[in-house]
Amino acid sequence: HHHHHHASQPCPYPMAPPNGHLSPVQAKYILKDSFSIFCEPGYELLQGHLPLKSFAAVCQKDGSWDQPMPSCSIVDCGPPDDLPSGRVEYITGPEVTTYKAVIQYSCEETFYTMKVNDGKYVCEADGFWTSSKGERSPPVCEPVCGLSARTTGGRIYGGQKAKPGDFPWQVLILGGSTAAGALLYDNWVLTAAHAIYEQKHDASSLDIRLGALKRLSPHYTQAWAEAVFIHEGYTHDAGFDNDIALIKLNNKVVINSNITPICLPRKEAESFMRTDDIGTASGWGLTQRGLLARNLMYVDIPIVDHQKCTAAYEKPPYSGGSVTANMLCAGLESGGKDSCRGDAGGALVFLDNETQRWFVGGIVSWGSMNCGEAGQYGVYTKVINYIPWIKNIISNF
């Protein structure tokens, strides 16, 4: 740093800015001598509003520094990102966004829950709001799934009328024939592949309605499809194996007591779906009168032993092998309670006794020609077999 040059005059003695220090410290600075400024943690080098990573000034021949002195300003993380379906609270003080300031994100109560972290973020020295786990991006408010106004736990045949909030995941799909689906998260619909197969290349033609109770009611939330994903193992007109599809909505829907997603089954869910456990199917499909229901209907039906169901569909007019391991059956041996045409794609749901949340165990798929027939059962896509497929699509799209 010392380049003594008799003809040059020393530069003015540099004074470090507040919250900064100067290095090296010398008695005087002459031609080609230099100094750097370093800021304390939580402070950043600025020239006006412009940030600098480092600063060094060199003493020139005319006795002036080649750079003006920067300032060390407290790091300001700026206003935190908004949280969809949530809010942010300033803990340190109103609108305080500088180094060490704390904010708390929270989600709208009842219908949303925070994913990823506890929502507490601190303005760190690098200028980013950071969670205790080191995440820089804000948390996510995920819809709470499986909430229902029902206190007890499709082709709806022999059922009863649903009340508001009983099946808030129920989706009415029009655009081809009447079908159903179940809301997952706030922008996906789970349905049967056969129900939307004709629209697979024309997603925008699907008319998707949420929060409706009466099939023809004008009171519903409209949604439109952005994309349709039909299981690659499903073959149209060749049985109903892999009868499962996902619809991505082009916008997130607002969750409330009438529009709430259904939960996907946990690993432990099979313990609530054993033979004779009760599931609930809902829909606007054909009723005992042979007409599409005006009001959303539901029916509580027990799960049927898989071998018993397989045997029931081995007799003509059915061909052997119709019922696969990717299906589950539900209904009464005596008949009279079933899902029916128009219910396809709807969810067969079960109550998880541990979480007290409803989850989708089956998707209304197919059944006997005459709904509710004795000795025949409704056949549902076994959702638990498709959790990796569902999660893969949702995480990638």
Epitope: Q47, G48, H49, L50, P51, K53, P68, G78, G127, F128
Partner: antibody
Framework: DVQLQESGPGLVKPSQSLSLTCTVT?????????WNWIRQFSGDKLEWMGY???????SYNPSLKSRISITRDTSKNQFFLHLSSVTTEDTATYFC???????WGHGTTLTVSS | DSVMTQSQKFMSTSVGDRVSVTCKAS??????VAWFQQKPGQSPKGLIY???YRSSGVPDRFTGSGSGTDFTLTISNVQSEDLAEYFC?????????FGGGTKLEVK
């Protein structure tokens, strides 16, 4: 020698989003400084839009705050301007520049028209 | 916002003259002011930063002065290649703001 080069679509329809790229050569955008987007309207008026700093932090003109985002790809030494819901008022020449303006790109002309 | 006002939109000068372009800030901007030269069809070129520091490669006939709210760019011994538009910029606070420009013309 430090060089900046803007690239973009040239023509965008109203209500669409705009994305412009600034490719920097001769200096790493993570080494130091603020990396700015500035635009110039037909009457020569210049408007600073925002910057992304060497650390990745950003600062935006409050008049554009709801529509603007500046991001970067450090592996390609590029930074980007994203502007949503464009209108004919966004028709301008867009420049990228370093620090206080010691280096500028040549500019890319954007027309917003249906 | 700090509004930067260049009250003279046009200035006439002759080769060899000395000319001063002024810029007034609506708020105190310290010395965080830069000056740019722009010729038709080109991007602006940085001349002065921090009110009085000449950018590398800029001829020493260009000098900047001022602090607080009043700033001046002086060109001594004007050359024909100096005929261009000159802008000031404050980078003291968000948003950074430019002056409206002053066009330097030949008499």
């Amino acid at each position: 020698d430090v060089q900046l080069q803007e690239s973009g679509p040239g023509l965008v329809k109203p209500s669409q989003s705009l994305s412009l790229t600034c490719t920097v050569t001769g200096y790493s955008i993570t080494s130091d400084y603020a990396w700015n987007w500035i635009r110039q309207f037909s009457g020569d008026k210049l408007e600073w839009m925002g910057y992304i700093s060497y650390s990745g932090s950003t600062s935006y003109n409050p008049s554009l705050k709801s529509r603007i985002s500046i991001t970067r790809d450090t592996s390609k030494n590029q930074f980007f301007l994203h502007l949503s819901s464009v209108t004919t008022e966004d028709t301008a020449t867009y420049f990228c520049a370093r620090y206080w303006g010691d280096y500028w790109g040549h500019g890319t002309t954007l027309t917003v028209s249906s | 916002d700090s509004v930067m006002t260049q009250s003279q939109k046009f200035m006439s000068t002759s080769v060899g003259d000395r000319v001063s372009v002024t810029c007034k800030a609506s708020h105190n901007v310290g010395t965080n002011v830069a000056w740019f030269q722009q010729k038709p069809g080109q991007s602006p070129k940085g001349l002065i930063y921090s009110a009085s520091y000449r950018s590398s490669g800029v001829p020493d006939r260009f000098t900047g002065s001022g602090s607080g709210t009043d700033f001046t760019l002086t060109i001594s011994n004007v050359q024909s290649e100096d005929l261009a538009e000159y802008f000031c910029l404050q980078y003291n606070s968000n948003p950074l703001t430019f002056g409206g420009g002053t066009k330097l013309e030949v008499k």
